[in-house]
């Protein structure tokens, strides 16, 4: 059962001091969705018992496993049903506390009634303030039964519920006709799903025989122990003032558990702590009584004394619940109350016993839940005990349940029951998930949903190339971490499977389903270098590069050119999609900008090493284009160009540049400088006869300006082929004429 306790502080003289605390002993309880499960919830349940609205109650979380409800302002705030919900997933459990007003007309003799299926439950409401009118019983808020006020027996109204079934469970109330619901007696009826001493589907399994008022859970056969007791059968008392499944919690305050009501998961319900009784749990047990609600009687023999918290304290030489067993009677020693094994394992179980006469191997036997008796295969005899070792046949799920070690000698016999949990090794329900991939490694998330039982102790990842018959490679990893599979082959499919293990021998589960994960292309390894670059304008740059010569095919799909503008913090990337390319024209750059330039080879999505960077300064943007450019053929080898100066110049022109290109020609254009910027005319000489040329020009101040319009003109015919065009300005021409 889930280790969950709801504590109610019953100091009722002052409602403002009243509080409810829910304590969970579960690992990771209450930490919320960022840990193992949902948080603890503690709330008033107004579905059945509705009380007048008041100020909202205050919820305070104390650490990860405790939550407290305060802020009750008046006694009526306390009346009704409170619930605490804790545990995760299928273990999510609700613990319920029912609070009665001490000033009600009717009071319950006992609030919580736990009964077995088929039993007769009797709810008893004691008359506290008499009214001569009908008493109405309700079940979960709906009409159930009516009693005439004359039907009271010894000042009590009884509701008999014969042959109860689990659906009969719930909140019952007894109210006088015309009285406030807050004056009702409220009860909680818990009906176990099985008859007395039975549990499991079909109620075929036998309960372990819970001691000290523990109640056998009808689903899992575990004993839900009263507060202050622990062990598989609640056989062990906690120290005074302690509670919880392992006695790990301590009652608050100097008076220990006095004045506290403890509510535990069904089918236990609520009671006072061990050693206390009364409607407010403030009365110590009467002599000879002990345990929760002082319901147990000591009946100590052989000089044992009764302790109201733990029961009989035996003198030397005696043991047993009532000190009825002589130490000469054999006794099972230090038997674990719970053992866990994995399915299909063949564990060894040890059982030690002492006594006089001394137990021997044949006097100790082990009984399985199905009644099969195992005899020990060997025994270790020591001066103070005999330890019998049992080799258990291969375990099946049906072996889960209560086993019993029994020792019999002529001095008597003793037996100890213990719970065996057969766990199913975990099997992944899904394939692992690929997170990232490179050419020689895959990063994988291995932990997936699984069938079977946790916790997961180790995760093994098995992998090998797809369609390979070679042995699987295996890597063992921490369950909470991602795995990197290294030293793989590039561009290769790998079959990857997960195997999960839980603690203990035989905890390895079957392999999960395979998935195909493919490594990336190989990384390009060649480092290019920049051969050179030249500025083709204020916003254009032509770049060229080279690669080292290596044998074999080139590993690469193309090149990536990167220009970094440090001033503006901007990067420009240019993709050259041919691995054969060794030059590229970069356009649309920012004039007057200092760029850092590099180039790298890429393959698939992977980049090779970058070239050593170059630093390039683009000239600032130049002046506007010259206007009204005009060309006029003068001879078979000369053409005259005329133009007008650009408008709105930012400064004095340092020169003009003329571009000359044969129309339709494939060669590079020729640039000719006109170094006398005041001129508006020049003659281009050395041209070929009968040839059509294209001309355009631009001015330069600090940087080159925009190109003018392009003009076409043909030289005159019948000339010889010239060496090539040259330029002569008008001023020079005039000089020659003189």
């Amino acid at each position: 059962a889930v280790d969950l306790t709801l504590l109610a502080n019953l100091r009722l003289t002052d409602p403002q001091r009243f509080f409810l605390t829910c304590v969970s002993g579960e690992a990771g309880a209450g930490r919320g969705s960022d840990a193992w499960g949902p948080p603890l919830l503690l709330e008033k349940d107004d579905r059945i018992v509705r009380t007048p609205p008041g100020p909202p109650l205050r919820l305070a979380r104390n650490g990860s496993h405790q939550v407290t409800l305060r802020g009750f302002s008046k006694p009526s705030d306390l009346v009704g049903v409170f619930s605490c919900v804790g545990g995760a997933g299928a273990r999510r459990t609700r613990v319920i506390y029912v609070h009665n007003s001490p000033g009600a007309h009717l009071l319950p003799d006992k609030v919580t009634h736990t009964v077995n299926k088929g039993d007769t439950a009797v709810l008893s409401a004691r008359v506290h303030k008499e009214k001569q009118t009908d008493v109405i019983w309700k079940s979960n808020g709906s009409y159930f039964y009516t009693l005439d006020w004359h039907e009271a027996q010894d000042g009590r109204f009884l509701l008999q519920l014969p042959n109860v079934q689990p659906p009969s469970s719930g909140i019952y109330s007894a109210t006088y006709l015309e009285a406030s619901p807050l004056g009702s007696a409220f009860f909680r009826l818990i009906v176990r799903g099985c008859g007395a001493g039975r549990w499991g589907p079909g109620c075929t399994k036998e309960c372990p025989g819970c001691l000290h008022g523990g109640v056998c859970h009808d689903h899992d056969g575990e004993c839900v122990c009263p507060p202050g007791f622990t062990g598989t059968r609640c056989e062990q008392a906690c120290r005074e003032g302690r509670f919880g499944q392992s006695c790990q919690e301590q009652c608050p305050g100097i008076s220990g558990c006095r004045g506290l009501t403890f509510c535990l998961p069904d089918p236990y319900g609520c009671s006072c702590g061990s050693g206390w009784r009364g409607s407010q749990c403030q009365e110590a047990c009467a002599p000879g009584h002990f345990g929760a609600d002082c319901r147990l009687q000591c009946q100590c023999q052989n000089g044992g004394t009764c302790d109201r918290f733990s029961g009989c304290v035996c003198p030397s030489g005696w043991h047993g619940v009532h000190c009825e067993k002589s130490d000469r009677i054999p006794q099972i020693l230090n038997m674990a109350s719970e053992l866990e094994f994995n399915l299909e394992t063949m564990p060894r179980i040890n059982c030690a016993a002492a006594g006089n006469p001394f137990p021997v191997r044949g006097s100790i036997e082990l009984r399985k839940p199905d009644g099969t008796v195992l005899l020990s295969t060997k025994a270790i005899v020591e001066p103070e005990k005999t330890t019998a070792e049992f080799e258990v046949p291969r375990l099946v799920l049906a072996d889960s349940g209560f086993w019993e070690c029994r020792v019999s000698t002529s001095g008597g016999q003793d037996s100890r029951r213990f719970k065996v949990n057969v766990k199913v090794p975990p099997v992944p329900l899904a394939a692992p998930r690929l997170l990232t991939k490179q050419s020689r490694q895959l990063v994988v998330s291995p932990l997936v949903s699984f069938s079977g039982d946790g916790p997961i102790s180790t995760v093994r990842l098995h992998y090998r190339p797809q369609d390979s018959t070679m042995d699987w490679s295996t890597i063992v990893v921490d369950p909470s971490e991602n795995v990197t599979l290294m030293n793989l082959r590039p561009k290769t499919g790998y079959s990857v499977r997960v195997q999960l293990s839980r603690p203990g021998e035989g905890g390895e589960g079957a392999w999960g389903p395979p998935t195909l994960m493919t490594t990336d292309c190989p990384e390009p390894l060649l480092q290019p270098w920049l051969e050179g670059w030249h500025v083709e304008g204020t916003d254009r740059l032509r770049v060229s590069w080279s690669l080292p010569l290596v044998p074999g095919p080139l590993v690469g799909d193309g090149f990536l050119l990167r220009l970094w503008d440090g001033t503006r913090g901007q990067e420009r990337r240019e993709n050259v999609s041919s691995p054969q390319a060794r030059t590229a024209l970069l356009t649309g750059l920012t004039p007057g900008t200092h760029y850092q330039l590099d180039v790298q080879l890429y393959h698939c999505t992977l980049l090779g090493p970058a070239s050593p960077p170059a630093h390039v300064l683009l000239p600032p943007s130049g002046p506007p284009a010259p206007r009204h450019l005009h060309a006029q053929a003068l001879s078979d080898s000369e053409i005259q160009l005329t133009w007008k100066h650009p408008e709105a110049l930012p400064g004095p022109i340092s020169k003009y540049v003329v571009e000359v290109q044969v129309a339709g020609g494939a060669g590079d254009p020729l640039w000719i400088d006109v170094d006398r910027p005041e001129e508006t005319s020049t003659i281009i000489r050395g041209l070929n006869a009968s040839t059509r040329y294209l001309f355009r020009m631009r001015a330069s101040i600090q940087g080159l300006g925009d190109w003018s319009n392009t003009v076409e003109e043909s030289t005159l015919g019948n000339g010889l082929q010239a060496e090539g065009p040259v330029q002569e300005s008008r001023a020079a021409e005039e000089g020659l004429d003189q």
Epitope: T133, D134, Y143, F144, T146, L147, W149, E151, E178
Partner: antibody
Framework: EVQLLESGGGLVQPGGSLRLSCAAS????????MAWVRQAPGKGLEWVSV????????YYADSVKGRFTISRDNSKNTLYLQMNSLRAEDTAVYYC???????????WGQGTLVTVSS | QSVLTQPASVSGSPGQSITISCTGT?????????VSWYQQHPGKAPKVMIY???NRPSGVSNRFSGSKSGNTASLTISGLLAEDEADYYC??????????LGTGTRVTVV
């Protein structure tokens, strides 16, 4: 569906006896108070008697006290009215009804006619 | 045990509202909030229309409403319909755990 079916009515001489039955179905009979209400021909309704679920408490109208006895058999889901020393003024249609807390009758039978005449 | 006093008859036109009174004592009507009203058509069994002074069972038209002041309870039928023509009886729980019924009122829709 809740159903109440009265039977046992008929003609009886003054001073005679008659036992009425009411068979209940469609609800947990043993949990409810049950009552008899009568209506003389052309007259109004008159409450006659009530019995508590356990049968441990019964109440009667003054007009029938000492002559009529209400009883129930929870194992048979049946309500009874034993009528002795009948008088002409007991002539009426007798209805059986289920009583809810606070004394209202939420389900009624169709009634059975008792005629007391010589 | 005395009966509760009701008017012998009340009439109204379709669409009108009518009110029927029911007078008792402090031991019945005045002492408890347990007054109920029943409708009875000729030859039929009674049917509960109002319980606990003013509560309507499911299936009963909201044209029927109940109230109480002192020792007198009232049933109001608003938007009178021809089908409302019937006998109406009040009933009360008493301090002696018994029941008392009214004299009955014939409602006529004119």
């Amino acid at each position: 569906e809740v159903q109440l079916l009265e039977s046992g009515g008929g003609l009886v001489q003054p001073g005679g006896s008659l036992r009425l039955s009411c068979a209940a179905s469609g609800f947990t009979f043993s949990h409810y108070k049950m009552a008899w209400v009568r209506q003389a021909p052309g007259k109004g309704l008159e409450w006659v008697s009530v019995i508590y679920p356990s049968g441990g408490a019964t109440y009667y109208a003054d007009s029938v006290k000492g002559r009529f006895t209400i009883s129930r058999d929870n194992s048979k889901n049946t309500l009874y009215l034993q009528m002795n020393s009948l008088r002409a003024e007991d002539t009426a249609v007798y209805y059986c009804a289920r009583a809810l807390p606070g004394g209202y009758f939420d389900y009624w039978g169709q009634g059975t006619l008792v005629t007391v005449s010589s | 045990q005395s009966v509760l006093t009701q008017p012998a008859s009340v009439s109204g036109s379709p669409g009108q509202s009518i009110t029927i009174s029911c007078t008792g004592t402090s031991s019945d009507v005045g002492g408890y909030n347990y007054v109920s009203w029943y409708q009875q058509h000729p030859g039929k069994a009674p049917k509960v229309m109002i319980y606990d002074v003013s509560n309507r069972p499911s299936g009963v038209s909201n044209r029927f409403s109940g109230s109480k002041s002192g020792n007198t309870a009232s049933l109001t039928i608003s938007g009178l319909l021809a089908e409302d023509e019937a006998d109406y009886y009040c009933s009360s729980y008493t301090s002696t755990a018994t029941y008392v019924l009214g004299t009955g009122t014939r409602v006529t829709v004119v």
